[in-house]
């Protein structure tokens, strides 16, 4: 088992909004849960966009999940990762 490296980034979207992206890379096996939480509960699936789980060329995998949020509410969002029985949560950077 190779645990993922998780990285959260933010980028400007439309006025007052940002897109937050959570990337997991260099993990094996390929089964992974990567999702955004808002206010500590699941963010609905229709407000998230997922990338495919793809090989990254080193025998490991990568994927991502993104959502668009209000800039001033970033504190309320965390990216949740679960892989091979391990869990972690990752805040949006300031």
């Amino acid at each position: 088992t190779v645990p993922p490296m998780v990285n959260v980034t933010r980028s400007e979207a439309s006025e007052g909004n940002i897109t937050v992206t959570c990337r997991a890379s260099s993990f094996y096996p390929r089964n992974i849960i990567l999702t955004w939480r808002q206010d500590g509960v699941s963010l609905s699936h229709d407000t998230q966009q997922w990338g495919d789980v793809l090989p990254d060329g080193n025998g490991t995998y990568q994927t991502w999940v993104a959502t668009r949020i209000c800039r001033g509410e970033a504190q309320r969002f965390t990216c949740y990762m679960e892989h091979s029985g391990n869990h972690s949560t990752h805040p949006v950077p300031s």
Partner: antibody
Framework: DVQLQESGPGLVKPSQSLSLTCTVT?????????WNWIRQFPRNKLEWMGY???????NYNPSLKSRISITRDTSKNQFFLQLISVTTEDTATYYC????????????WGQGTLVTVSA | DIQMTQSPASLSASVGETVTITCRAS??????LAWYQQKQGKSPQLLVY???MLADGVPSRFSASGSGTQYSLKINSLQPEDFGSYYC?????????FGAGTKVEIK
């Protein structure tokens, strides 16, 4: 460490309002987190009532939505519960708690305060 | 709303025994589950979050598992301080709801 302490009257008459205070020490309620009220009925059933978060946004249990209000006083680092038109069914131990945004579980609770609704 | 059904409602066990408490959700909660222990006259205390993760300071004789709608809390070699009530709570969506509790008593 975050510490929470509930206070308020232990006896309320039916049809009146129940008002409780949660005083938070060790952390500013405007810095982060969701600040919650949870109650436990005499037969031990637990019910999440709602929260006010660090920015003042509230979220209530729909079963209580028409009767509940959660507010705060940031200068005193306190948040409040008001429940209107109470009945004997609102007799319970009321707890304040908080959760972080990594997940809505409750790491610490106040000691609880028993409120009896009775004429 | 997601309803949480706990079983058994109560159980009697001896010190040293292994006990298992189960919690069933009315819908898939995707491991968004916590467990609490409550002693008589005290506030609930967090034991487990994210379905399987032990909270800080929780002894390793406690373990939790599950997925989808079915979850369990296991206590190996029950100790005197483990007697009390146990509650599950989901945090998949609002409103947050709790199970009705399981009371663990001394046989």
């Amino acid at each position: 460490d975050v510490q929470l302490q509930e206070s308020g009257p232990g006896l309320v008459k039916p049809s009146q309002s129940l008002s409780l205070t949660c005083t938070v020490t060790g952390y500013s309620i405007t810095s982060d987190y969701a600040w919650n009220w949870i109650r436990q009925f005499p037969r031990n059933k637990l019910e999440w009532m709602g929260y006010i978060n660090y920015s003042g946004t509230t979220n209530y249990n729909p079963s209580l939505k028409s009767r509940i209000s959660i507010t705060r006083d940031t200068s005193k680092n306190q948040f409040f519960l008001q429940l209107i038109s109470v009945t004997t069914e609102d007799t319970a131990t009321y707890y304040c708690s908080y959760y972080r945004y990594d997940g809505a579980w409750f790491p610490y609770w106040g000691q609880g305060t028993l409120v009896t609704v009775s004429a | 709303d997601i309803q949480m059904t706990q079983s058994p409602a109560s159980l009697s066990a001896s010190v040293g025994e292994t006990v298992t408490i189960t919690c069933r959700a009315s819908g898939n909660i995707h491991n968004y589950l916590a467990w609490y222990q409550q002693k008589q006259g005290k506030s609930p205390q967090l034991l487990v979050y994210n379905a399987i993760m032990l909270a800080d300071g929780v002894p390793s004789r406690f373990s939790a598992s599950g997925s989808g709608t079915q979850y369990s809390l296991k206590i190996n070699s029950l100790q005197p301080e483990d007697f009390g009530s146990y509650y599950c709570q989901h945090f998949w969506s609002f409103p947050l709801t709790f199970g009705a509790g399981t009371k663990v008593e001394i046989k």
